[in-house]
Each structure stands twice: as C-alpha cells, then as structure tokens.
Amino acid sequence: ALDTNYCFSSTEKNCCVRQLYIDFRKDLGWKWIHEPKGYHANFCLGPCPYIWSLDTQYSKVLALYNQHNPGASAAPCCVPQALEPLPIVYYVGRKPKVEQLSNMIVRSCKCS
Amino acid sequence: ALDTNYCFSSTEKNCCVRQLYIDFRKDLGWKWIHEPKGYHANFCLGPCPYIWSLDTQYSKVLALYNQHNPGASAAPCCVPQALEPLPIVYYVGRKPKVEQLSNMIVRSCKCS
C-alpha cells in the first residue's frame, strides 16, 4: 500500500504519500484553533504509471492509454485513499471544546 | 455537478470532465473485443481552486493551503467521481459473449 509506512521510508518517485505540515494560522489563516497549532496533513504526489496502485478499471484503461499515447494530457492522478480525523481544541468563550475534524490527514494514496 | 451535461456544453477551465475516445486496438492494444471498436471513456482535467467541487475536508484544506502558498506542489487533483460500465461483445470461438466491463466511462469529476 502507498501508505506512510512505505512512502516515508522510501525514495519512491511514483505516486506516494508525502510529508506536509500545515500551520493553522500561517497556512490556512485559521486563528481560532487553540490546539494543535498545526498538524501533519501530508499530501499525495508522483506519477501514476501503468499498474501503479490503480484505483478502478477506468484508471487502468487511462494508464494503458497513456502507455500507448505518451504525452497525452489524459492520465491518472495521485490522490488520497485513506484519510484520518484530527482532534482539535478550540474555545467557545472561556469554555474549551474538543472536536474531531473528519478526513484531515492523508494516510495513503492511490492513482485515480 | 462537473458532469458531461455541464462540462461538454461549457468552456470551463477548472476541473471538468473532458471528451476522450479510446480505440481498443490502437490505444490499448486489445484486438479481441468485437464490439464496440472503441468508446467515449472521457477524462478529468483542470485546476482545483478553493471551493471548486472539493471532495473532502482534506481537499478543502489543501486548496486553502494552496491559496496561502501559491506554487506549492501540494494541491487537489481533478479525478473521476461517477463512473459507468461499458457493455462489450467478444467471441469465445464462434460463440459471441456479452459482458459488462465495470467503471469504464467517466460521467463526472471532482477535486480530490
């Protein structure tokens, strides 16, 4: 699987999950989150050659089409597969509130 | 929705479904399919700016990150959303066989 275990410990050039730290204030302009100040969101990047973790029949077709038509603009793209939530703390007045923001962290990628 | 109805009738520059015809022999190297000779597979293409048909919380975060960090390599990607099957006819000896190939046609796209 193109997950953090594999991708972070390899020099994989094809589609894989990459490290990305997002600072809530600086990168998103969100000042209201108290904790954490930022988080490891990660992102998906890399080419999707034929057979590389292809998601559907269609992505297999497109990768095969690409093999026969190099330089075509139609190609599968490396996108998130498994996403995880992020717990945050923010204040409502003086009262801290804990909430889960769903689908915030990329754990693995696929070619779609 | 970024579907064929909208995208084929507009000059949309952002993520949208685009027309692509695939010839089984020429583009995939498949000689064994009797009918059809090819089909309109379509493909997804175009940038994914903030708020443009974003798929998950994560893709919203990434688009926002991109807005704050122009030129960053982390960005949402335009990929298939709705896929449809394709019926094909091939011969097993002299006997025709009809089969559905699942997820072969792109009907709409999303930013993921």
């Epitope: - | 995939l28 064994w32 000896g93 002299r94 066989k97």
Partner: antibody, heavy 121, light 111 residues
Framework: QVQLVQSGAEVKKPGASVKVSCKAS????????MNWVRQAPGQGLEWMGQ????????NYNEMFEGRVTMTTDTSTSTAYMELRSLRSDDTAVYYC??????????????WGQGTLVTVSS | DIQMTQSPSSLSASVGDRVTITCRAS??????????MHWYQQKPGKAPKLLIY???NLESGVPSRFSGSGSGTDFTLTISSLQPEDFATYYC?????????FGGGTKVEIK
C-alpha cells in the same frame, strides 16, 4: 523478453485444493488472456480455462466448472489457478500460457515452465 | 466439443527426411475467412512451443522448414528437411469452438 515463471511442485492428498501461481514479466500483463493447460503423465494437453487480467473475465472448460477458479493480481502481474476436490487423475503438469491476443480463445505463444501437481494418499 | 485426431500417433524418420503430420477436426474450424488451427512442438520435460498459427502462419523465430496447410477439417504440418532438434512430439490445437482442444500428439522419433 516475455517470461512466465510458475510456482514449484506440489504434493496433495485427495480432496484437497492446490493453487498454482504464474508470474508474468516482459509484457503488459493486463492486455492478454492467460490460459491454463494441463498434461497428465505421458498424455496429451488439456485446456482448463482462461482469464483476462484487466477485468477478471473468465472462460472455463465445462469439464472443470465448479472445481477451478482462475484469478490474477495485477499489482504483481501474477495469475493463479486453484483446483479443488483433487483426485488422483488430477496428477499432471499444469502450465500457464499467454494467448497471442487476437481473440479470447487463441493460439498460445508463451508458456510457463510447468508445475507438477501430484495427488496421492 | 471438437475432437482432434492426429495421425500417425508416432513415426520414425531420419535427419533430412520430409515429414508430414495430419490433423483432422470433427467439424470445420473455419470462420471469418480463417482456419482456427495451430501447431505446437513439445520436447520431453519442456513446455509446448508455438510453431504455426491460423493453419499456415509461421510463428516468429521458427525455422522456415516448418510449414502448415489445410482448411475446414483437414490440416497438415510439414517439416521439409528434418533436423536433429526436431525430434519431439507435435500437437495441433483448435480454437473455433469452446472448449479449446488439442490433438493427441504425434511423436517423431529417430529411425
């Protein structure tokens, strides 16, 4: 160059199942039908069935229907043939063989080295 | 199922001989203007090797001394001048009907 490398010899008891693998290299695995053919000791060739790796479409010889399952793993370009409820007359060399690509049923241009399956109590 | 009958089942020949093997199908294997008949060579302990496809087409890399002919139900494999490496068993195969079937084989031995 095209190569089909099969798993090693197996000894099985009657009633058991066997799963033979065939790893393909040197060509686009998902674009050609993969056939399975067997040959009992000193006998001729018998076609068991085939699979198209792209879609998983299969055509089985009726003689094996219900006892055989052909599958593929496209991520490793490997084809598998599982035969269940083994009998002593299933003792044979099992070959995977690539169809030449013009039709589903076709001539076969590349063959694996064969896997001997012995069924004995 | 289409039955494939090869003859002879075995033959003895010498290097340089012209050898002819025949294959008869229980029904015509012709359609779409092609004869769906193929020939293979198999040596002991080895996998079969494709020699001729669609009755008369020589597979790439196969010596030109091998040739195939025929249509309908009757087909022939000819080796124009037998070489030492040609001693093997030869099989015909049809793919006009499901299931694909093979002939019983013809063993070519050294005289």
């Amino acid at each position: 160059q095209v190569q089909l490398v099969q798993s090693g010899a197996e000894v099985k008891k009657p009633g058991a199942s066997v799963k033979v693998s065939c790893k393909a290299s040197g060509y686009t695995f998902t674009s050609y039908w993969m056939n399975w053919v067997r040959q009992a000791p000193g006998q001729g060739l018998e076609w068991m069935g085939q699979i198209f790796p792209f879609s998983g479409s299969t055509n089985y010889n009726e003689m094996f229907e219900g006892r055989v399952t052909m599958t593929t793993d496209t991520s490793t370009s490997t084809a598998y043939m599982e035969l269940r409820s083994l009998r002593s007359d299933d003792t044979a060399v099992y070959y995977c063989a690539r169809g030449i690509g013009n039709y589903a049923l076709d001539a076969m241009d590349y063959w694996g080295q064969g896997t001997l399956v012995t069924v004995s109590s | 199922d289409i039955q494939m009958t090869q003859s002879p089942s075995s033959l003895s020949a010498s290097v340089g001989d012209r050898v002819t093997i025949t294959c008869r199908a229980s029904e015509s294997v012709d359609f779409w203007g092609n004869s769906f008949m193929h020939w293979y060579q198999q040596k002991p302990g080895k996998a079969p090797k494709l020699l001729i496809y669609l009755a008369s087409n020589l597979e790439s890399g196969v010596p030109s001394r091998f040739s195939g002919s025929g249509s309908g139900t009757d087909f022939t494999l000819t080796i124009s001048s037998l070489q030492p490496e040609d001693f093997a068993t030869y099989y015909c195969q049809q793919n006009a009907e499901d299931p694909l079937t093979f002939g019983g084989g013809t063993k070519v031995e050294i005289k």
